[in-house]
Interface confidence: low
C-alpha cells in the first residue's frame, strides 16, 4: 500500500487524528490512515480509519461499540486461555504482558501434549504449541485441544464427530471453525486461532509455516503407514512421475497496492519460483495480475510455463501501470481466470487430470471491493477437481490455496475464507508490510532451514564467512612434540566430513583430531577416520617416488549428529539425488550425465575456499579437463621429489583433477592449510563438490603470506570424486544421500 504523507486528496482534515504515543500514515491517497505504534504496542481502539464522504474520519469505536475521543498506543497483551480441559494453568490473568509466561499442568492420569510453558510475544501471539491434557482414551481421534483465546464446543472425539471453535467479540477466527474427526485419526481443517486486528505474523513464522506446508506438497515423500487411531499423520505426497503440479501466482495490482509494493510482491514471487526450482520440481506456472479485470500473463498450457527462467522473465516484465485505468479490486474475476486455466475444453478431462496438484498463491492488500464474493469460485474449483466429494478419497491434497494479506487494510475474515485449511499447516498469512513479506521470501529462498538441501548458501551482505561457505570444516591434528597439521574439509552429511587422507597418519588418535564447523569455537568429537583403502603415501617409495597421493581421501565420522542451520549445511556430492535436484536435472538423470554436466571435456570454472588472515575467501580456478589437461599434468614434474619421474602418469593417476597455471586465466593456488578442502563447481546457485584438494607443485605460501607472482607451472592436484564413488557410496550408505 503506498504511504503518502501529504495532505489527503479526500476532504478529511488531519486535525485531531493524532494518536497518543505513536504516529499515523496515510493510505490510498488520503482516503484512509493507519496508526503506527512502537514495537510491543498497538493502536487502540482501531488500527485504521477511513475518510468518509461527509468529510470526517470514521469514528474511534471499541469492540463493544463505545466511542473513544483520542486514539492511543497501548501495550500489546496476549489473550488468556478461555478454558483448559483436564488441567490447570498459571498464573490466571485476564490477559498477559509481552514476555509473560503461562504454564500448563495436567490432572493425575492425563499427559500433557504441546508446550508446557508459553511466552507472550511482541505481536500479541503466544509462542509454542497448544497444550492439551490427554488420557489417550478420549476417542478415535485425540483431543484437538483449545487454542488459547478460543472456546471449544464439543467433547466427543469419535469418528465423524465434530467440534466447533468460537472467538470472543471483536476477534477474528483464523483457521477452521469446525473440525471433524476423520478416518486415520486426524482432524479435518487446520487449528484455529483468534486474531486481533493488530496481530501480524512475523517473517520467520511465515517463512517456516509456508515452507513446511509447501514442502508437504512438493517434497515427494511417502506417507508412513500404520497410523493408529489418535496418531497425527503428516501429509506427505508421492509425486507420481506421471502426475504434475500447476502453481498459479495471482497478484493484486489495484491502486491501493501501489507501485513499490507491487514491485516487492514480484520480487517475492521470483524468489518463490527459484525456491521451487531448487527442489528439482518443474511445475507449470500460471501468472495473473488483477485490479478491476484480471490479466493472464502466463497460461499453464503454454509450452514454456514449466521453464522457471522464462516464467521469471515474464514476471519481471509486468508493469504496475498495466492496471492503471481500471483499478478496483475484483478478486472473484482473478480466481475465475485461474479456473479457466484449470478447466478443460469441451468439459472432457484429459488423461491424468486427477494426478495434477494445483497450488494458488494470492497476494493482496485488502481483497475484493467489487465483483462479489470470490469464495464461490474456490467452491467451483473444488468441484472441478472433485475435491471433498468422496469421503473415502477427499483429494484435499490436490488443491492448496495460500493467501498473503499485506498491510493494515486486510480483511481477515475474507482471506481466511479463501485459504485452504489443512491439519498442522497454515495457508493464510497476514504481514505488516511488503518489506516484511519480502523478508519472508528472502528467508525462504536463502535459508531453507526446514530442509537439508545440499550446496545452498545464504549470500547476503550481512552474512558471515560461514553463511557463505556453510559446508566448510576446519581440521587440525595435534601431534605432541611435532606441532600441528592444519587442513580443511567439507560437511557432506550430518555425521561425516570429507577431507584428504594425507592430513592424518596412522598414529593419530581420534582425540588429537580437532574439527570445527560453522565458525564455531568448539571442536566436534570424532568417532573414527576412514581412509580410502587404496591410499598409501609410501606405496611407490621403491620406485623413487617419495610421496604418492593417489586416492588421497578420508571421511571423518563424528560422534554426534550435526545440527544444520544457516552456517552449517552440507555440500552436494556427485551422483546423488540431491545434486540431481540442485542442478534441476530430470529425476532419471544418471551418474554419467551428472559427470558430463559437471566435468565436461573443457576448461571448467571452479572454486576452492581458503583461509586468509582468519577470513574465508573463495578462489576461482579452472579445472583443465580439455586440451590443456596434458600440459597441466606434465607440470607435476616440477614438484619437489618428482623431478626424476620418467612417466608422469606414475604420480598423476586418473584419480586427479588439475588446476593452476596462467591459461585461460592466472589461477590462484592452494596452500598447505587448504588441503582436504573441497574443489567446487558453482551451478544454478548451488555448490557441488567435484574434488578434494590434495597437493601442489609449488609452495606459493611461504611465510603464511600468499605471493602475488607465481610461476606458470604452479599447479594443484585434487582427487576427482567421480573416481572414488564406490567408496563414498559404501561409507555414506546410511546418510540418506540417495546415491545414483
Amino acid at each position: 500500500t503506498p504511504w503518502s504523507l501529504a495532505r489527503p486528496q479526500g476532504s478529511c482534515s488531519l486535525e485531531g487524528v493524532e494518536i497518543k504515543g505513536g504516529s499515523f500514515r496515510l493510505l490510498q491517497e488520503g482516503q484512509a490512515l493507519e496508526y503506527v505504534c512502537p514495537s510491543g504496542f498497538y493502536p487502540y481502539p482501531v488500527q485504521t480509519r477511513t475518510c468518509r464522504s461527509t468529510g470526517s474520519w470514521s469514528t474511534l469505536k471499541t469492540q463493544d461499540q463505545k466511542t473513544v475521543r483520542k486514539a492511543e498506543c497501548r501495550a500489546v497483551r496476549c489473550p488468556a486461555p478461555v478454558s483448559f480441559e483436564n488441567g490447570i494453568y498459571t498464573p490466571r490473568l485476564g490477559s498477559y504482558p509481552v514476555g509473560g509466561n503461562v504454564s500448563f499442568e495436567c490432572e493425575d492420569g492425563f499427559i500433557l501434549r504441546g508446550s508446557p510453558v508459553r511466552q507472550c510475544r511482541p505481536n500479541g501471539m503466544w509462542d509454542g504449541e497448544t497444550a492439551v491434557c490427554d488420557n489417550g482414551g478420549a476417542g478415535y481421534c485425540s483431543n484437538p485441544g483449545i487454542p488459547i483465546g478460543t472456546r471449544k464446543v464439543g467433547s466427543q472425539y469419535r469418528l465423524e464427530d465434530s467440534v466447533t471453535y468460537h472467538c470472543s467479540r471483536g476477534l477474528t477466527l483464523r483457521g477452521s471453525q469446525r473440525r471433524t474427526c476423520q478416518e486415520g485419526g486426524s482432524w479435518s481443517g487446520t487449528e484455529p486461532s483468534c486474531q486481533d486486528s493488530f496481530m501480524y505474523d512475523t517473517p520467520q513464522e511465515v517463512a517456516e509455516a509456508f515452507l513446511s506446508s509447501l514442502t508437504e506438497t512438493i517434497e515427494g515423500v511417502d506417507a508412513e503407514d500404520g497410523h493408529g487411531p489418535g496418531e497425527q499423520q503428516k501429509r506427505k505426497i508421492v509425486l507420481d512421475p506421471s502426475g504434475s503440479m500447476n502453481i498459479y501466482l495471482v497478484l493484486d495490482g489495484s491502486d491501493s497496492i501501489g507501485a513499490s509494493n507491487f514491485t516487492g510482491a514480484k520480487k517475492c514471487l521470483v524468489n518463490l519460483i527459484e525456491k521451487v526450482a531448487s527442489y528439482g520440481v518443474k511445475p507449470r506456472y500460471g501468472l495473473v495480475t488483477y485490479a478491476t479485470y484480471p490479466k493472464i500473463w502466463v497460461k499453464v498450457s503454454e509450452a514454456d510455463s514449466s521453464n522457471a527462467d522464462w516464467v521469471t522473465k515474464q514476471l519481471n516484465e509486468i508493469n504496475y501501470e498495466d492496471h492503471k485505468l481500471k483499478s478496483g479490486t475484483n478478486t472473484k474475476k482473478a480466481l475465475q481466470a485461474v479456473y479457466s486455466m484449470m478447466s478443460w475444453p469441451d468439459d472432457v478431462p484429459p488423461e491424468g487430470w486427477n494426478r495434477t496438484r494445483h497450488v494458488i498463491i494470492l497476494m493482496t492488500d485488502g481483497l475484493h471491493n467489487m465483483g462479489g464474493d470470490p469464495i464461490t469460485v474456490i467452491d467451483e474449483i473444488r468441484d472441478l477437481l472433485y475435491i471433498g466429494k468422496d469421503r473415502k478419497n477427499p483429494r484435499e491434497d490436490y488443491l492448496d490455496v495460500y493467501v498473503f494479506g499485506v498491510g493494515p487494510l486486510v480483511n481477515q475474515v475474507n482471506i481466511n475464507a479463501l485459504a485452504s485449511k489443512k491439519d498442522n499447516e497454515q495457508h493464510v498469512f497476514k504481514v505488516k508490510d511488503m518489506e516484511n513479506l519480502e523478508d519472508v521470501f528472502y528467508q525462504m529462498i536463502d535459508e531453507s532451514q526446514s530442509l537439508s538441501l545440499c550446496g545452498m548458501v545464504w549470500e547476503h551482505r550481512k552474512g558471515t564467512d560461514y553463511h557463505k561457505q556453510p559446508w566448510q570444516a576446519k581440521i587440525s591434528v595435534i601431534r605432541p612434540s611435532k606441532g600441528h597439521e592444519s587442513c580443511m574439509g567439507a560437511v557432506v552429511s550430518e555425521y561425516f566430513v570429507l577431507t584428504a587422507a594425507h592430513c592424518f597418519t596412522v598414529d593419530d588418535k581420534e582425540h588429537s583430531i580437532k574439527v570445527s564447523v560453522g565458525g564455531e569455537k568448539r571442536d566436534l568429537e570424532i568417532e573414527v577416520v576412514l581412509f580410502h583403502p587404496n591410499y598409501n603415501i609410501n606405496g611407490k617409495k621403491e620406485a623413487g617416488i617419495p610421496e604418492f597421493y593417489d586416492y588421497d581421501v578420508a571421511l571423518i565420522k563424528l560422534k554426534n549428529k550435526l545440527k544444520y542451520g544457516q552456517t552449517i549445511r552440507p555440500i552436494c556430492l556427485p551422483c546423488t539425488e540431491g545434486t540431481t535436484r540442485a542442478l534441476r536435472l530430470p529425476p532419471t538423470t544418471t551418474c554419467q550425465q551428472q559427470k558430463e554436466e559437471l566435468l565436461p571435456a573443457q576448461d571448467i570454472k571452479a572454486l576452492f575456499v581458503s583461509e586468509e588472515e582468519k577470513k574465508l575467501t573463495r578462489k576461482e580456478v579452472y579445472i583443465k579437463n580439455g586440451d590443456k589437461k596434458g600440459s597441466c599434468e606434465r607440470d607435476a614434474q616440477y614438484a619437489p621429489g618428482y623431478d626424476k619421474v620418467k612417466d608422469i602418469s606414475e604420480v598423476v593417476t586418473p584419480r586427479f583433477l588439475c588446476t593452476g597455471g596462467v591459461s585461460p586465466y592466472a589461477d590462484p593456488n592452494t596452500c598447505r592449510g587448504d588441503s582436504g578442502g573441497p574443489l567446487i563447481v558453482h551451478k544454478r546457485s548451488r555448490f557441488i563438490q567435484v574434488g578434494v584438494i590434495s597437493w601442489g607443485v609449488v609452495d606459493v605460501c611461504k611465510n603464511q603470506k600468499r605471493q602475488k607472482q607465481v610461476p606458470a607451472h604452479a599447479r594443484d592436484f585434487h582427487i576427482n570424486l567421480f573416481q572414488v564413488l564406490p567408496w563414498l557410496k559404501e561409507k555414506l550408505q546410511d546418510e540418506d544421500l540417495g546415491f545414483l
Epitope: D439, Y442, Q443, W458, R461, E613, K615
Partner: antibody
C-alpha cells in the same frame, strides 16, 4: 586489549589538507572495517566513511566523497583519513572507530581535534 | 539517506526513575532477520561508547539497566533505574546500508 590511538590535534588554514592517523592494536588489523566519524563542538556525530583494511575497499558518505580519502598501512596496523579543501565548518573532533561483527562501532579512538582557521 | 530522528532532544529524569529515548528511521533498518540499529552513550570530552547492538543486544560490560527494543523503523532505548553516571548524550545509529547515519542525539540530565 583492543586500542585505537589517534594522532594529535591539528590547526589548519582554509583550503589546506589534514591527515589523521589511527594506530590499532590488540586484534588482527585486517579482520575488521575501520570507520571515521566526526563531531563538531556541541553537535552530533557524522559518519565520514569506512575502509576494509584487508582489501582496502572503501565506502564514503556522499557529503565527503572527493574530499575525504581513507587509506591503511597494514604493516603497521594504521588507518589514515585525509580531508582536503578544508573550510571552517570542518572544525571538529575526528574519531576512528572499529566495526564489530554486527557493523556497530565497538571501539573508538580518543579523537583528534582539527581546527580550521585563517 | 536513512534519516534517524531521536525524541526527545533532551530530558531530565530523577535518580532511580525510568528513562526512555526513541529513535525513528525514515526507512526500515531490518534485513535478513536483524535490525541494524545500535545505541551509544557519550559523555563530554570522551568518545562515544557502544551500549546496544542490533536493536536489543547488550554489549558485554554494559549494566543491564540498559535495554533496547524495536523493529523496522521504530526503536527505543530504556534505562530502567537511572544512576548518576548515566547523565550523558545518547545516539542511535544504523548500519543497514551505506551511508551509515546517526540520530541527532538526546541529552539526558538528572532531575
Amino acid at each position: 586489549e583492543v586500542q585505537l590511538v589517534q594522532s594529535g590535534a591539528e590547526v589548519k588554514k582554509p583550503g589546506a589538507s589534514v591527515k589523521v592517523s589511527c594506530k590499532a592494536s590488540g586484534y588482527t588489523f585486517t579482520d575488521y572495517n575501520m570507520d571515521w566519524v566526526r563531531q563538531a563542538t556541541g553537535q552530533g556525530l557524522e559518519w565520514i566513511g569506512d575502509i576494509n583494511p584487508n582489501y582496502e575497499s572503501t565506502g564514503y558518505n556522499q557529503k565527503f566523497k572527493g574530499r575525504a580519502t581513507m587509506t591503511v598501512n597494514k604493516s603497521i596496523s594504521t588507518a589514515y583519513m585525509e580531508l582536503s579543501s578544508l573550510r571552517s565548518e570542518d572544525t571538529a573532533v575526528y574519531y576512528c572507530a572499529r566495526e564489530d561483527d554486527h557493523d556497530a562501532f565497538a571501539y573508538w579512538g580518543q579523537g583528534t581535534l582539527v581546527t580550521v582557521s585563517s | 539517506d536513512n534519516v534517524l530522528t531521536q525524541s526527545p532532544d533532551s530530558l531530565a529524569v530523577s535518580l532511580g526513575e525510568r528513562a526512555t529515548i526513541s529513535c525513528r528511521a525514515s526507512k526500515s533498518v531490518r534485513t535478513s532477520g536483524y535490525n541494524y540499529m545500535h545505541w551509544y552513550q557519550q559523555k563530554p570530552g570522551q568518545p562515544p561508547k557502544l551500549l546496544i547492538y542490533l536493536a536489543s543486544n547488550l554489549k558485554s560490560g554494559v549494566p543491564d539497566r540498559f535495554s533496547g527494543s524495536g523493529s523496522g523503523t521504530d526503536f527505543t532505548l530504556t534505562i530502567s533505574s537511572l544512576q548518576a553516571e548515566d547523565a550523558a548524550t545518547y545516539y542511535c545509529q544504523h548500519s543497514r546500508e551505506l551511508p551509515y547515519t546517526f540520530g541527532q542525539g538526546t541529552k539526558l540530565e538528572i532531575k
